[in-house]
């Protein structure tokens, strides 16, 4: 969480951004809020990116003005026009690219004053893992698959019964480059599993941590997956 203030004493307004992560090839949001103004026509929003000459996005006089937008953001950005009046300057970003990572500035002008705040935007790939029984294996095995990760993550297995056990000797993890030559498919197989146990496949890189659980009993199989962005925490 980053809170910025204007520089000129009483003519400053509070602008707040939230550090976030973008999933390559998906659509993302760069979060920014500010002290609202009564009149939409008095609000100017400028999004800038460090190292980029043109603007990322500009909104003024109640509408977008993309005259000075940098080519790399052409056709990819939008503010939530109906929410600007209540102080939401967040930016929608289409088709997130690795090169979108960096430091962004949300700069606001209203009738009350000016303010800005920086935002660190990380980009990578992350996806939910799915754990299934691996019927192809000779022994009772589990297969954990996640379709898109970048940078290359670590994969760790754990079990409820054997807490603290190291499964690296009885598991095999592979990374297969996807067709766009950036993200990778993660496949990890855990061998010699036992019934009446819950196993967890944990995939983590510097952007996200995902867990796939499977509970195997004689009568049923239960699965659960979760994903947490590591750099969204204030």
């Amino acid at each position: 969480l980053i809170i910025g203030f204007g520089i000129s004493g009483r003519h400053s307004i509070t602008v707040t951004t939230l550090t976030s992560a973008g999933n390559i090839g998906e659509d993302g949001i760069l979060s920014c809020t500010f002290e609202p103004d009564i009149r939409l026509s008095d609000i100017v929003i400028q999004w800038l990116k460090e190292g980029v000459v043109g603007l990322v996005h500009e909104f003024k006089e109640g509408k977008d003005d993309l005259s000075d937008q940098d080519e790399m953001f052409r056709g990819r950005t939008a503010v939530f026009t109906d929410q600007v009046i209540v102080g939401n300057a967040s930016l929608r970003l289409k088709n997130v690219q690795l090169t979108d990572a960096g430091t962004y500035k949300c700069y606001i002008i209203t009738s009350k004053g000016k303010g800005n705040a920086n935002l660190e935007y990380k980009t990578g790939a992350f996806s939910m893992p799915e754990v299934n029984l691996d019927y192809n294996a000779s022994s009772e095995s589990l297969r954990c698959e996640a379709p898109r990760w970048f940078p290359q993550p670590t994969v760790v297995w754990a079990s409820q019964v054997d807490q603290g056990a190291n499964f690296s000797e009885v598991s095999n993890t592979s990374f297969e480059l996807n067709s766009e030559n950036v993200t990778m498919k993660v496949v990890s197989v855990l061998y010699n599993v036992t019934v009446n146990n819950t196993y967890s496949c944990m995939i983590e890189n510097d952007i996200a941590k995902a867990t796939g659980d499977i509970k195997v009993t004689d009568s049923e199989i239960k699965r659960r997956s979760s994903l947490q962005l590591l750099n969204s925490r204030a």
Partner: antibody, heavy 120, light 107 residues
């Protein structure tokens, strides 16, 4: 409501330059949240996006046509234009102009289209 | 460029029946997809954008769904004016591309 109207010659000779103009009425071409695009459709076939322009003059073209395409804008006349050089019979198509959202980038509304035939 | 593939090429449906049209992208386009209707001699008309948001003035019988690479346009109960060609279009990345179209004809 906003309307778009294409105009230009319906017949162009091979190797010459196709020139079309789109006149926008019922709204300003300087509306900030939109690009202005050209799309074409060969007879009995599908749609192909040619490119777009912002009122400030910045353009983006389909790479397959980039070497032959120029799109320009005249805000004083509320018009934008397409030029396609070195045409061949394969460029025979109905040419549409349309308003294109800056994002989301859907096309709405469209002009009624004008058929351009390339033939000697 | 992203290739959009529509199926079937032709769909024969009786008035009042449901029509389901498919569109597949060669790579993920997230929800950045639009659907258009085109009648003979007319320009295309926007039906759906953002994969599932109906454009202004479009009847509720038209609905869009899907994300990533698989998309569907459903016409819940075909009216006589719905017989036309339907195109999907991705705007996820340049160049924007259209599918080859699905012709919905009277059975």
């Amino acid at each position: 409501q906003l309307q778009l109207q294409e105009s230009g010659p319906g017949l162009v000779k091979p190797s010459e330059t196709l020139s079309l103009t789109c006149t926008v009425s019922g709204g300003s071409i300087k509306s900030g949240s939109y690009y202005w695009g050209w799309i074409r459709q060969p007879p009995g076939k599908g749609l192909e996006w040619i490119g777009n322009i912002y009122y400030s003059g910045s353009t983006y073209y389909n790479p397959s046509l980039r070497s032959r395409v120029t799109i320009s804008v005249d805000t004083s006349k509320n018009q934008f234009s397409l030029k396609l050089s070195s045409v061949t019979a394969a460029d025979t198509a109905v040419y549409y102009c349309a308003r294109e959202g800056s994002y989301p980038n859907q096309f709405d509304p469209w002009g009624q289209g004008t058929l351009v035939t390339v033939s000697s | 460029e992203i290739v959009m593939t529509q199926s079937p090429a032709t769909l024969s449906v009786s008035p009042g029946e449901r029509a389901t049209l498919s569109c597949r992208a060669s790579q993920s386009v997230s929800s950045n997809l639009a659907w258009y209707q085109q009648k003979p001699g007319q320009a295309p008309r926007l039906l759906i954008y953002g994969a599932s948001t109906r454009a202004t003035g479009i009847p509720a019988r038209f609905s869009g769904s899907g994300s990533g690479t698989e998309f569907t346009l459903t016409i819940s109960s075909l009216q006589s004016e719905d017989f036309a060609v339907y195109y999907c279009q991705q705007y996820h990345s340049f160049p924007f591309t259209f599918g080859g179209g699905t012709k919905v004809e009277i059975k």
